[in-house]
Interface confidence: low
């Protein structure tokens, strides 16, 4: 019998309110044994797959997706999904990235530390269980 895959979680470092031009890193977490993590935009066909998965704890694995210089176009909802053979997980909750026009730099106190979305309610839109772990040629750690 196939195991039920736990839903991934998503968080953003240093937070979800990021000054224009600063960096943000999305952290996707799931169980051990994950082959591919995917960070995707809401219903948007641009997404980023990575197989650069590290063990965050004895029971958790994670992947990190970095945007070096955030622009207005990076604002919006993000979520994670992972592939643990032989199937894809459900999606994480959405995490909303806000881009703030400010003179503050990457370490500005305007950023909200430790924002995350854990495995609570299931989003109502498209299931990704049909997905094959096909990379779109986007580089992990450099989403856009």
């Amino acid at each position: 019998q196939e195991e039920d895959l736990p839903r991934p979680s998503i968080s953003a470092e240093p937070g979800t309110v990021i000054p224009l031009g600063s960096h943000v890193t999305f952290v996707c977490r799931g169980p051990v044994g994950v082959q591919t993590f995917r960070l995707e935009r809401e219903s948007r066909s641009t997404y980023n797959d990575t197989e650069d998965v590290s063990q965050a704890s004895p029971s958790e694995s994670e992947a990190r997706f970095r945007i070096d210089s955030v622009s207005e176009g990076n604002a919006g909802p993000y979520r994670c999904i992972y592939y643990k053979p032989p199937k894809w997980s459900e999606q994480s909750d959405y995490l909303e990235l806000l881009v703030k026009e400010t003179s503050g730099g990457p370490d500005s106190p305007d950023t909200e530390p430790g924002s995350s979305a854990g495995p609570t309610q299931r989003p109502s839109d498209n299931s990704h269980n049909e997905h094959a772990p096909a990379s779109q040629g986007l580089k992990a750690e450099h989403l856009y």
């Epitope: 948007r44 066909s45 176009g73 997905h131 772990p133």
Partner: antibody, heavy 118, light 110 residues
């Protein structure tokens, strides 16, 4: 040569389910997103939905529940579950440029005409 | 919800003239905008993507500009063959939209 061609357009009565097929050649559906777009007579282009390489789908708000996009190895289908006269249009299948939505749609079929009339 | 407004609905200019078509997004889309040309009875043709990048085989008379919410397609040195409808398309979201295309602009060559 890379090409996209729609088929299945015909005259049907309102409420009769209809499936249109887009056949692609010269490239792989495992590398490209594919869209369906329609155009009513004398009107503009109207986006219906998209299918991603992994098989998941996205739809315009108005199209959700009315249309279903699916695919096989070299075909992409559009099912109209219960057509009305307002669904009369030419239906186009289009490939997303360089496999990424931000690049627009670079390869279009000639379209297939669907007429819904009683 | 992201909507696209295109103006004017129609325009008429002489051969050799210049046409300017504007497209406005209801929210910022960066440079994620495409332009298409469609002649009567034909399929649409991609002209420009990423707001200003010419698609393969498109002459440099076609120029796209703009970012954020306001975009422009300029066609200079107009030729008879440029008579067509032109559409903008937001290339930012593929979901949670009613339509990704603007309403279109019909260009007539005098």
């Amino acid at each position: 040569e890379q090409s996209v061609e729609e088929s299945g357009g015909r005259l049907v009565t309102p409420g009769t389910p209809l499936t249109l097929t887009c056949t692609v050649s010269g490239f792989s559906l495992s590398s490209f997103h594919m869209c369906w777009v329609r155009q009513a007579p004398g009107k503009g282009l109207e986006y219906i939905g998209i299918i991603y390489p992994g098989g998941s789908t996205g739809y315009a708000n108005w199209a959700k529940g009315r249309f279903t996009v699916s695919k096989a190895s070299n075909t992409v289908d559009l099912k109209i579950s219960s057509p009305t006269t307002e669904d009369t249009a030419t239906y186009f299948c289009a490939r997303v440029n360089y496999g990424d939505w931000i690049n627009g749609m670079d390869l279009w079929g000639p379209g297939t005409l669907v007429t819904i009339s009683s | 919800e992201l909507d696209m407004t295109q103006t004017p609905a129609s325009v008429s200019e002489p051969v050799g003239g210049t046409v300017t078509i504007k497209c406005q997004a209801s929210q910022s889309i960066g440079s994620n905008l495409a332009w298409y040309q469609q002649k009567p009875g034909q399929r649409p043709k991609l002209l420009i993507y990423k707001a200003s990048t010419l698609a393969s085989g498109v002459p440099s008379r076609f120029k796209g500009s703009g970012s954020g919410t306001d975009f422009t397609l300029t066609i200079s040195d107009l030729e008879c063959a440029d008579a067509a409808s032109y559409y903008c398309q937001q290339a930012y979201w593929s979901g949670n939209v009613d339509n990704v295309f603007g309403g279109g602009t019909e260009v007539e060559i005098k």
